[in-house]
Amino acid sequence: EEELQVIQPEKSVSVAAGESATLNCTATSLIPVGPIQWFRGVGPGRELIYHQKEGHFPRVTPVSDPTKRNNMDFSIRISNITPADAGTYYCVKFRKGSPDVELKSGAGTELSVRAKPSAPVVSGPAVRATAEHTVSFTCESHGFSPRDITLKWFKNGNELSDFQTNVDPAGKSVSYSIRSTARVVLTRRDVHSQVICEVAHVTLQGDPLRGTANLSEAIRVPPFLEFTQQSMRADNQVNVTCQVMKFYPQRLQLTWLENGNVSRTEMASALPENKDGTYNWTSWLLVNVSAHRDDVKLTCQVEHDGQPAVNKSFSVKVSAHPKEQGSNTAAENTGTNERGSSDYKDDDDKHHHHHH
């Protein structure tokens, strides 16, 4: 009689998570009588997966009816595979006894589980940065197997090259995680920009997963300030405007100071958006020139997104004129009959841009 051989025809089997895995095993002889057992791993720590004779194995079913006469097919099917099921499975023949005696093992079948990566999650910097600065974006995806995976970064459709990627763990594992950090240089035009992290894996059948982040969450575009002064009106009032231009985000407070004293404070709200995603805002102040003996120093002070204030000052020149009794010494949005002349002098800009 030929000596019993236990044949596991496949060296390896790859199965998608959630599917069933069939592990094939046949014996070449009915002799000796005794059960088959399936184990994962070898040695004293091996894990019993299926015992033909005894035990309850709800996820495992024999492919061939074990009661079938002359049965030599000991293949099993494991249902609802998860990455934790990965490993090498051995079909082992035992000789009937008390207890049964291990006789011969198959060569083993390595089960690898194809598990899809989770949707990539892209996170940006905790604080905003201004143009010309470099910010880091991180992309993470978890739970995939096998380990081979491709990750790409894009900004507005253009592939980025400045990034570093790690797949963990380095050794064998049931599933893996990827983490990549990309460095992106901001420009003033990036309010509408997007960074995309794209993950390609064998389980995705050529349809990569994408995670996105909007640069609008990471960028701060500081405003430009500009003054205009309309010529003196008949009622001795001058309309001065402070134009706050090309800023993002919208969070902005503007304060008018006359000779260093706060005249008015306003908060920006519900502003229309420019094409590039930035905002403009114009604030005006009526200065009653006849109420002043000396030149008036006007300051437009802008606090943008919690940053230190940006100031722009200029002087309204007041020519000598008789002061009527009862008139205001400083007027805002008020009219008098006094006439006077004024010259407009734009002081040096005092822009204090503080970057992180």
Partner: antibody, heavy 119, light 110 residues
Framework: QVQLVQSGAEVKKPGASVKVSCKAS????????INWVRQAPGQGLEWIAM????????HYNQIFKDRATLTTDTSTSTAYMELRSLRSDDTAVYYC????????????WGRGTLVTVSS | DIVLTQSPDSLAVSLGERATINCRAS??????????IFWYQQKPGQPPKLLIY???NLDSGVPDRFSGSGSGTDFTLTISSLQAEDVAVYYC????????FGQGTKLEIK
């Protein structure tokens, strides 16, 4: 280890029925055939029938086909053999036996149940 | 149905001597290298015990003084050196078709 524990002795009148039970332990009940064999006093072994507890497939000796019925209860790992229309020559020890190698052999045996048919 | 005929019906052998029991099938019970014959030992008041399966393979725990041989239709159970505890009735069984037993051979000590 494998154990087959049979029900106790029965005394029946001719024409009656008897149902013998066989409770299995020490193995997966649904993975092995159960055979029923009888032995009249001082006589040889006579195979009655066999059942696969996983799907209740049965094979009967033609001699017993019309009078014997095999059943199983997988929830209690118990096999039953009912014999109807008893005659005096049905007096015998009835054995259940497990086929461990799926070779239609009898590897493990119960201790037997004596059924006496007498008027 | 296959009929199994054992010979002799009874046998007396001295302790330490060889005992041989034959079993003949009414048709071949061999196929693909397997011989579908089984041998059982039954002692008084006990159920039968499987000794040999597929004609020549000793079941677990059976002393190696027992052996089986044969193919086709003719099979033999041999006890190489009879021991007192071997006194019993021996049955052959075929499973080529549905199981049938031989009529039994009673083995005694001479």
């Amino acid at each position: 280890q494998v154990q087959l524990v049979q029900s106790g002795a029965e005394v029946k009148k001719p024409g009656a029925s008897v149902k013998v039970s066989c409770k299995a332990s020490g193995y997966t009940f649904t993975n092995y055939w159960i055979n029923w064999v009888r032995q009249a006093p001082g006589q040889g072994l006579e195979w009655i029938a066999m059942i696969d507890p996983s799907d209740s497939e049965t094979h009967y000796n033609q001699i017993f086909k019309d009078r014997a019925t095999l059943t199983t209860d997988t929830s209690t790992s118990t096999a039953y053999m009912e014999l109807r229309s008893l005659r005096s020559d049905d007096t015998a020890v009835y054995y259940c036996a497990m086929d461990y190698g799926s070779l239609y052999a009898m590897d493990y045996w119960g201790r037997g149940t004596l059924v006496t048919v007498s008027s | 149905d296959i009929v199994l005929t054992q010979s002799p019906d009874s046998l007396a052998v001295s302790l330490g001597e060889r005992a041989t029991i034959n079993c003949r099938a009414s048709k071949s019970v061999s196929s693909s290298g397997y011989n579908y014959i089984f041998w059982y030992q039954q002692k008084p008041g006990q159920p039968p015990k499987l000794l040999i399966y597929l004609a020549s393979n000793l079941d677990s725990g059976v002393p190696d003084r027992f052996s089986g041989s044969g193919s086709g239709t003719d099979f033999t159970l041999t006890i190489s050196s009879l021991q007192a505890e071997d006194v019993a009735v021996y049955y052959c069984q075929e499973s080529w078709e549905l199981p049938t037993f031989g009529q039994g051979t009673k083995l005694e000590i001479k």
